[in-house]
């Protein structure tokens, strides 16, 4: 039966009809009492006092309502949940993930996890209603957990008309013996000992380091991974593992050349709620590799939206060469990651200036052959974009990737809803298209326009009359991603390049074929 529920937009928690709850007001000491009424939360401030007993984890401050028994936790940065039990910065799980308290909420199939408090799970052995729910990490959220000591975190998903458990696609912290780091590498305990410039690390117990804070003599050395070795570590929460080095007889430090463990192509996909001409409105967390590129024009003040882009590593964005025909100076370009609304700043967005950009030197502005460009983001360190639920790299395809004809893939972008529209979309959109066989991606299928081996075609193959809302890329989507699921990860197959109109029946969009440029990409991204 259909149930009216409320979703608290601030916390993403769900509540049943007539259920009440307390919530802290961000950046203030106020607390609100909320009540679920006909699918809408009605909230007002209430007086509170300090709790009589500690109820919050991870340093949360407990406050209880003055006139009734409920309590609320003000969580320190990096923690969330009713009792601050959720670690919003956990990027991977250790061992079987029994202690995992992160925010991954996507199953291996790509399905979105169901909130553990959902009434649909009331009869399941594990739900947020259990008396030991907090201890097991269950509660009013839909994050992957391993409450039953299974082999890895899992959750309930709704498929084939019922709720069943499915393993999650949460990244594992230690992938076999691969020597790489997750997040900022503060948990890295591998054996790399060379810096990015090729210098050898000094042992953390070296006499030369006397007087330095982070050495084997630090009282917390063991917990920080420091000792009688010269392995790279990140004891101070820096951007990535580093070490002390001697450079020209001077003591300094450098970041290490430890590779970061790839979480590329993993995302927390949420089913789009709104159809729109040419596609569906989407959230950036579903397409965390999507970049928005803005440009300052010599003639007009301010910045205007230019093109889409694709995050392929911390400091590099892939885009389409034709977006840069105006030859903008790099300092006139801005790249924004983590933004759902094209011109409205997102809470977790990351904004970058551009160090330089490289347009393929054989780009043909008549045919759009070799329509590919790379932008290097500007940063003070060797890291630029910080991974989060809304910012993550896409996977580059293996060189020999050959997906079957008609494979369903997706594209995203902030482009127009239809060819004749004067405006770009105000919100990120996604579209679902299928890969055309090369026999259907030729000049004769595209009004005699040149189609080269560096291009591929994809389009919406659904039938429908003239009013059918066929999915496609459109003006403004250029430079953005065409991604397909491969080995459980979203993999970049094409770069949105050109097309004849938008969303026309039997007329596919044309994309730059990424597998043809892997060596070019790698070559140009060299340090």
């Amino acid at each position: 039966s259909y149930q009216v529920i409320c979703r608290d937009e601030k916390t993403q928690m769900i509540y049943q009809q007539h259920q009440s709850w307390l919530r802290p007001v961000l950046r203030s000491n106020r607390v609100e009492y909320c009540w679920c009424n006909s699918g809408r939360a009605q909230c007002h401030s209430v007086p509170v006092k300090s709790c009589s007993e500690p109820r919050c984890f991870n340093g949360g401050t407990c406050q209880q309502a003055l006139y009734f028994s409920d309590f609320v936790c003000q969580c320190p940065e990096g923690f969330a949940g009713k009792c601050c039990e959720i670690d919003t910065r956990a990027t991977c799980y250790e061992d079987q993930g029994i202690s995992y308290r992160g925010t991954w909420s996507t199953a291996e199939s790509g399905a979105e996890c169901t909130n553990w408090n959902s009434s649909a799970l009331a009869q399941k052995p594990y739900s947020g209603r259990r008396p030991d729910a907090i201890r097991l990490g269950l509660g009013n959220h839909n994050y992957c957990r391993n409450p039953d000591r299974d082999s890895k975190p899992w959750c309930y998903v709704f498929k084939a008309g019922k709720y069943s458990s499915e393993f999650c696609s949460t990244p594992a912290c230690s992938e076999g013996n691969s020597d790489c780091y997750f997040g900022n590498g503060s948990a890295y305990r591998g054996t790399h000992s060379l810096t990015e410039s090729g210098a050898s690390c000094l042992p953390w117990n070296s006499m030369i380091l006397i007087g330095k804070v982070y050495t084997a003599q630090n009282p917390s050395a063991q917990a920080l991974g420091l000792g009688k070795h010269n392995y790279c570590r990140n004891p101070d929460g820096d951007a990535k593992p580093w070490c002390h080095v001697l450079k020209n007889r001077r003591l300094t430090w450098e970041y290490c050349d430890v590779p970061s463990c790839s979480t590329c192509g993993l995302r927390q996909y949420s089913q789009p709620q709104f159809r729109i001409k040419g596609g569906l409105f989407a959230d950036i967390a579903s397409h965390p590799w999507q970049a928005a590129i803005f440009a300052k024009h010599r003639r007009s003040p301010g910045e205007r939206f230019l093109c889409g882009g694709i995050l392929i590593s911390s400091c590099w964005i892939l885009s389409a060469a034709h977006c840069f025909q105006e030859r903008f100076p790099p300092h006139h370009l801005t790249v924004i990651l983590g933004r759902t609304y094209r011109v409205v700043p997102g809470e977790e967005e990351q904004k970058f200036e551009v160090e330089k950009y490289i347009v393929h030197k054989e780009f043909d502005d008549d045919t759009y052959d070799n329509d590919i460009a790379l932008l290097q983001l500007k940063s003070d360190s060797s890291r630029c974009a910080q991974e989060s639920s809304v910012v993550r790299t896409v996977c580059l395809p293996p060189a020999d990737l050959q997906l079957p004809d008609w494979t369903e893939c997706e594209l995203s972008g902030y482009g127009k809803h239809e060819a004749l529209s004067p405006f770009y979309s105000e919100r990120l959109k996604e579209a679902h298209v299928r890969l055309y066989p090369s026999s259907r991606c030729t000049s004769q299928h595209l009004l005699n326009r040149t189609v080269t081996d560096n291009m591929l075609c994809a389009g919406d193959t659904r039938s429908g009359g003239p009013q059918a809302n066929l999915h496609d890329a459109c003006q403004g989507d250029s430079g953005g991603p065409l991604v397909c699921l491969n080995d459980g990860r979203m993999t970049l197959v094409g770069i949105i390049s050109w097309g004849l109109g938008c969303g026309q029946k039997d007329v596919p969009g044309v994309y730059t074929k990424v597998t043809n440029y892997l060596d070019w990409i790698r070559d140009n991204m060299r340090p």
Epitope: G198, D257, K356, P398, A399, T515, R522, R526, P527
Partner: antibody, heavy 114, light 112 residues
Framework: QVQLVQSGAEVKKPGASVKVSCKAS??????INWVRQATGQGLEWMGR????????GYAQKFQGRVTMTRNTSISTAYMELSSLRSEDTAVYYC?????????WGQGTLVTVSS | DVVVTQSPLSLPVTPGEPASISCRSS???????????LEWYLQKPGQSPQLLIY???NRFSGVPDRFSGSGSGTDFTLKISRVEAEDVGVYYC?????????FGGGTKVEIK
């Protein structure tokens, strides 16, 4: 530290093919390059492979005769040279490239003789 | 293809004295990403080559500071401030900016 260990010496007849392997340990995400050196001669770059994605770049001189592959599960790169002739007799090196060819294998002598 | 020419072909040296090797490319070796991938390698007798200098002037880890690299565009130089007996071998300059990557012909450094 990256370490590269190559397969042993080979003797081949003209027209045959040879496949040399290069096992990497340490940071295995860098390009593997192949360089050859005929006895008493200089170094000659043959091509490169990205061990992650498997993309390759070959010197024109070897295009069509050389194939570079990799097996990521065992961190090994391979260089196969076909239609061998006597002038292909050389020591073949693999070298790992990040900002330069910083780490080299010990070399594999391939002798082409009838 | 970029042709890389080294001179001299052979360089007899006295320990403690300086030495210099020149390397010239047939065209600019500035990569499209702005970097200049000019490297110097030393191959000691019976050994694999070893990296000395990368990106024109950066010394690789463990390389003594008597080795230095300089230059730009098409002209590059490797200098050894005071040659030591262990520095003998063949020195190669190499460009990694344009495919095919190419080595110079080599300079044989030997003690007088």
């Amino acid at each position: 530290q990256v370490q590269l260990v190559q397969s042993g010496a080979e003797v081949k007849k003209p027209g045959a093919s040879v496949k040399v392997s290069c096992k990497a340990s340490g940071n295995t995400s860098y390009w593997i390059n192949w360089v050859r050196q005929a006895t008493g001669q200089g170094l000659e770059w043959m091509g490169r492979i990205d061990p992650g994605g498997g993309s390759t770049g070959y010197a024109q001189k070897f295009q069509g005769r050389v194939t570079m592959t990799r097996n990521t599960s065992i961190s090994t790169a391979y260089m196969e040279l076909s239609s061998l002739r006597s002038e292909d007799t050389a020591v073949y090196y693999c070298a790992s490239y990040y900002y330069a060819m910083a780490y080299w294998g010990q070399g594999t002598l391939v002798t082409v003789s009838s | 293809d970029v042709v890389v020419t080294q001179s001299p072909l052979s360089l007899p040296v006295t320990p403690g004295e300086p030495a210099s090797i020149s390397c010239r490319s047939s065209q600019s070796i500035v990569h499209s990403n702005g970097n200049t991938y000019l490297e110097w390698y030393l191959q000691k007798p019976g050994q694999s080559p070893q990296l000395l200098i990368y990106k024109v002037s950066n010394r690789f880890s463990g390389v003594p500071d008597r080795f230095s690299g300089s230059g730009s565009g098409t002209d590059f130089t490797l200098k050894i401030s005071r040659v030591e007996a262990e520095d003998v071998g063949v020195y190669y300059c190499f460009q990694g900016s344009h495919v095919p990557w190419t080595f110079g012909g080599g300079t044989k450094v030997e003690i007088k």
